[in-house]
Every structure is written in structure tokens, then in C-alpha cells.
């Protein structure tokens, strides 16, 4: 169900690693991007 | 479906603390956090922080370091927030959110009086 | 922290009649990185939790009526109502998720005229 923007990510990055870094507001903005799915907040209904 | 249940009302005299907890269903509890927002009598949203259910990392509001307390439990899949020294000023409706607000639970009315 | 101020504090629309709600922020919610505004609008009812609306500042969620829409870039940002129904008498608050405290608008109440 979470979407992959493969352009928004470095390194082949995962949901794990991404949230491991949630440090920076970067890291937050990529993260909730990453969990796009259906909504930017993540996941399919 | 994506669901988060509150615990009830409570009634605390200043200087208590108070502790809410949220319960989450309908998604994967670890790949998302919970933000706490609260709001007011008659006020608007306030945002208080965000915890992630991955790893138990917290970003608080500045206004309230110190006095709040947010946790997870990973096999229960539920969040929790705890707020310290209370004051009058704290009496409010408090909602936990999965991350920055796409669902949210159905409040918890916390009436702060001597 | 990221300031929002949304206009005007109430708004009074006949029904069938269109309602604007605006939302300006402090500063940009634009990333570069993937041209997203991290911008989001909620309508609350009394004794409700709010109700997402709309998020990347002009994508309806999923159930909401298609009268409401979203739009704007960078700052400045606008919800539209296009045809009032009664249903639709609530508060509506702007967010922004851009940068932590994720903030909100003050709230702008929509009644009918």
C-alpha cells in the first residue's frame, strides 16, 4: 500500500531507515512524502 | 479501518498530572506517529508534539517541554500522553492524530479545577 | 515558528452561494524537493474531532463532496466552498506539516447567511 517515489529517495532508501533519521525537518518532510499511498499523513483507506 | 479510540474525561485539581491514552487500529502502529493537538474551550488547535511509534522518538512543543510525556506501547498499538503540573489554562479537549492529522481520535475532555 | 493566518475570523454565505477561506503562512511550505506544499485544511463540527479535508494543499481526501477545493502555492493558499450546503456550517483550520510545531490557522467559522 505505501508508494515508493524513487525520485523523492536516495540510496534506496526504506520506510526503517527514513524513520530511524527522523531528526531534521527534512527527514520529516521526506518521510511523510515516502508514506504518500492515498494521503501525504500515508496509507490506502 | 484506520481508527483511534480515547480514553475518557477526566477531572484533575492543579498541580496533578493527567495521562490519556489513544488506541490505534486499521494500519500498521509502527509505521506511523501520533501527534497530540489539544484545544480549548471555545479556542482553536494547538499542537503539543509527535512521538513516533517506530522507535519511541519525540518532538515536543517548546511551550510544554518539560510538562509532557509522550509514549508508545507497541503491542498494545496505543499512544500515550501525560501532562504534569496541571493548571487551569490546560483544561481543554485533548486528540492524538495518526502523524501531522490524517485520522484523529474522538477527544478526551481534561477539566483542570480546584 | 511557522505562523498561520487565515481571513476572514467568520463568514456568512447563502447556500448554494460560494465561500473562500484564506490561509497565508509565515513562510514557504514548499518543498523544492518534490514541489509539495505541506499544507492541509479541516472543517470541525461542535463536539467533533476535526475531519481532513484536503492535504498537499489542493488533494481532496478520499469521501469529501467535490464542491471543496484547494489551491495556492508557497504562502499563500485558499480553500474553496462552490456551493454552500447547510451541512457545511463549521470551523475550518489551515495547517502546515512543513516544519515542526506543525501549526494552525485560528479557524474561520462558516455560517449560513
Known amino acids: 500500500k505505501h508508494k515508493c517515489f524513487r525520485n523523492s529517495l536516495e540510496n534506496n532508501e526504506t520506510l526503517e531507515s527514513i524513520m530511524n533519521t527522523l531528526e531534521s525537518e527534512e527527514d520529516f518532510r521526506k518521510y511523510f512524502y515516502y508514506l504518500e499511498g492515498s494521503k501525504g499523513g500515508g496509507g490506502s483507506k | 479501518q484506520v481508527q483511534l479510540v480515547q480514553s475518557g474525561a477526566e477531572v484533575k485539581k492543579p498541580g496533578a498530572s493527567v495521562k490519556v491514552s489513544c488506541k490505534a487500529s486499521g494500519y500498521t502502529f509502527t509505521s506511523y506517529g501520533v501527534s497530540w493537538v489539544r484545544q480549548a474551550p471555545g479556542q482553536g488547535l494547538e499542537w503539543m508534539g509527535w512521538?513516533?511509534?517506530?522507535?519511541?522518538?519525540?518532538n515536543y512543543a517548546q511551550k510544554l517541554q518539560g510538562r509532557v510525556t509522550m509514549t508508545t506501547d507497541t503491542s498494545t498499538s496505543t499512544a500515550y500522553m501525560e501532562l504534569t503540573s496541571l493548571r487551569s489554562d490546560d483544561t481543554a479537549v485533548y486528540y492524538c492524530?495518526?502523524?501531522?492529522?490524517?485520522?484523529w481520535g474522538q477527544g478526551t475532555l481534561v477539566t483542570v479545577s480546584s | 515558528d511557522i505562523q498561520m493566518t487565515q481571513s476572514p475570523d467568520s463568514l456568512a454565505v447563502s447556500l448554494g452561494e460560494r465561500a473562500t477561506i484564506n490561509c497565508k503562512s509565515s513562510?514557504?511550505?514548499?518543498?523544492?524537493?518534490?514541489?509539495?506544499?505541506?499544507l492541509a485544511w479541516y472543517q470541525q463540527k461542535p463536539g467533533q474531532p476535526p475531519k481532513l479535508l484536503i492535504y498537499w494543499a489542493s488533494t481532496r481526501e478520499s469521501g469529501v463532496p467535490d464542491r471543496f477545493s484547494g489551491s495556492g502555492s508557497g504562502t499563500d493558499f485558499t480553500l474553496t466552498i462552490s456551493s454552500l450546503q447547510a451541512e457545511d456550517v463549521a470551523v475550518y483550520y489551515c495547517q502546515q506539516y512543513y516544519s515542526t510545531p506543525w501549526t494552525f490557522g485560528q479557524g474561520t467559522k462558516v455560517e449560513i447567511k
Open positions: 513562510q514557504s511550505v514548499l518543498y523544492s524537493s518534490n514541489n509539495k506544499n505541506y
Open positions: 512521538i513516533s511509534a517506530y522507535n519511541g522518538n519525540t
Open positions: 492524530a495518526r502523524n501531522w492529522g490524517d485520522y
